[in-house]
């Protein structure tokens, strides 16, 4: 028969022959022959391959270096890599999460729109009119100004995006 020029899914072409790829979690030891199936071997401890492959070496699991603020979020298997995340109060600098930086805080006049996670930084937003933030924080949202009216008080000093209003007693009208 004519030697193949293309192979089925999960196969590869070598020396005019279609050989089965090794399944995830296994590496190639020896190509198939007309008489013998592809020889594959499971990846060792701390190694993985996550696709059907013809790799002769498994990949090393990622190391979550505590010196870089990293910790293991999900332990790797023979078919998956280790997933790293950052220690509390830190977040990854990239999608690959190779190092961590401290969450940023929102300055006075800004509040937290979205609290940081292990993979994303704090998202701040300016406090709109009627709201303020007088602290630098990675957790505090903008607070609404105090409503003097509900306390039967009057505004003595207008609020800003960084300060609350100051309420005071109403002036009594003399008869």
């Amino acid at each position: 028969p004519e030697p193949p020029t293309a192979c089925r899914e999960k196969q590869y072409l070598i020396n005019s022959q279609c050989c089965s790829l090794c399944q995830p979690g296994q590496k190639l030891v020896s190509d198939c022959t007309e008489f013998t199936e592809t020889e594959c071997l499971p990846c060792g401890e701390s190694e993985f391959l996550d696709t059907w492959n013809r790799e002769t070496h498994c990949h090393q699991h990622k190391y979550c270096d505590p010196n870089l603020g990293l910790r293991v979020q999900q332990k790797g298997t023979s078919e998956t890599d280790t997933i790293c995340t950052c220690e509390e109060g830190w977040h990854c600098t990239s999608e690959a999460c190779e190092s961590c930086v401290l969450h940023r805080s929102c300055s006075p006049g800004f509040g937290v729109k979205q609290i940081a996670t292990g993979v994303s930084d704090t998202i701040c937003e300016p406090c709109p009119v009627g709201f303020f933030s007088n602290v630098s924080s990675a957790f505090e949202k903008c607070h609404p100004w105090t409503s003097c009216e509900t306390k039967d008080l009057v505004v003595q000093q207008a609020g800003t995006n960084k300060t609350d209003v100051v309420c005071g007693p109403q002036d009594r009208l003399r008869a």
């Epitope: 020396n15 020896s30 198939c32 022959t33 007309e34 008489f35 013998t36 199936e37 020889e39």
Partner: antibody, heavy 117, light 109 residues
């Protein structure tokens, strides 16, 4: 450990038959092609026959074609060589060997076949 | 049929010396499918080199293979006492038959 052990050799008269066996252990026998290779006393290696892992493909050396039959029983992890119409020139040590794309990587210790009247 | 011719037939050397064994094919052989075997008296052959130049598992690095096309070489850089044996080349690219060379005997001088 990975091992091949041949048996069934002996002294036989010309024209008679003999069946050799090769018992495999320590590996997935049903995934590998298997060969028979022989060596006449004081001579070199001569390839005899090969069978594919599931038994569908078989090839023979011209010197044994039509007289020898290679077969396998994967449920018993055993390879066979049925030798009919034996001749004096078939006298040899018969080895079974495992097929890979790297050559014959595992060999048995051999079994001696002597064809003599 | 590819015929493999090995030379010399016998090589007489002393331990520590370098051995160079030749295997010539009657037509071009894919180097992916050229192997070398070692055989000691009363023992089965042992795979030494496959793919013309790759050492099999557990084979010491004093053994090396080279060559392509029709000319292949097995080199033993420094002969150890246990290396005195018969060496066979084999092609398994073009079959049937899978052919062996006639062998080279490496003997102690």
């Amino acid at each position: 450990q990975v091992q091949l052990v041949e048996s069934g050799g002996g002294v036989v008269q010309p024209g008679r038959s003999l069946r050799l066996s090769c018992a495999a252990s320590g590996f997935t026998f049903s995934s590998y092609g298997m060969h028979w290779v022989r060596q006449a006393p004081g001579k070199g290696l001569e390839w005899v026959a090969v069978i594919s892992y599931e038994g569908s493909n078989k090839y023979y050396a011209d010197s044994v074609k039509g007289r020898f039959t290679i077969s396998r029983d994967n449920s018993k992890n055993t390879l066979y060589l049925q030798m009919n119409s034996l001749r004096a020139e078939d006298t040899a040590v018969y080895y079974c060997a495992r097929d890979t794309s790297r050559g014959h990587d595992i060999w048995g210790q051999g079994t001696m076949v002597t064809v003599s009247s | 049929e590819i015929v493999l011719t090995q030379s010399p037939g016998t090589l007489s050397l002393s331990p520590g010396e370098r051995a160079t064994l030749s295997c010539r094919a009657s037509q071009s052989v894919s180097s992916s499918y050229l192997a070398w075997y070692q055989q000691k008296p009363g023992q089965a052959p042992r795979l030494l080199i496959y793919g013309a130049s790759s050492r099999a598992t557990g084979i010491p690095d004093r053994f090396s293979g080279s060559g392509s096309g029709t000319d292949f070489t097995l080199t033993i850089s420094r002969l150890e006492p246990e290396d005195f044996a018969v060496y066979y080349c084999q092609q398994y690219a073009d079959y049937p038959p899978f052919t062996f060379g006639g062998g080279t005997k490496v003997e102690i001088k």
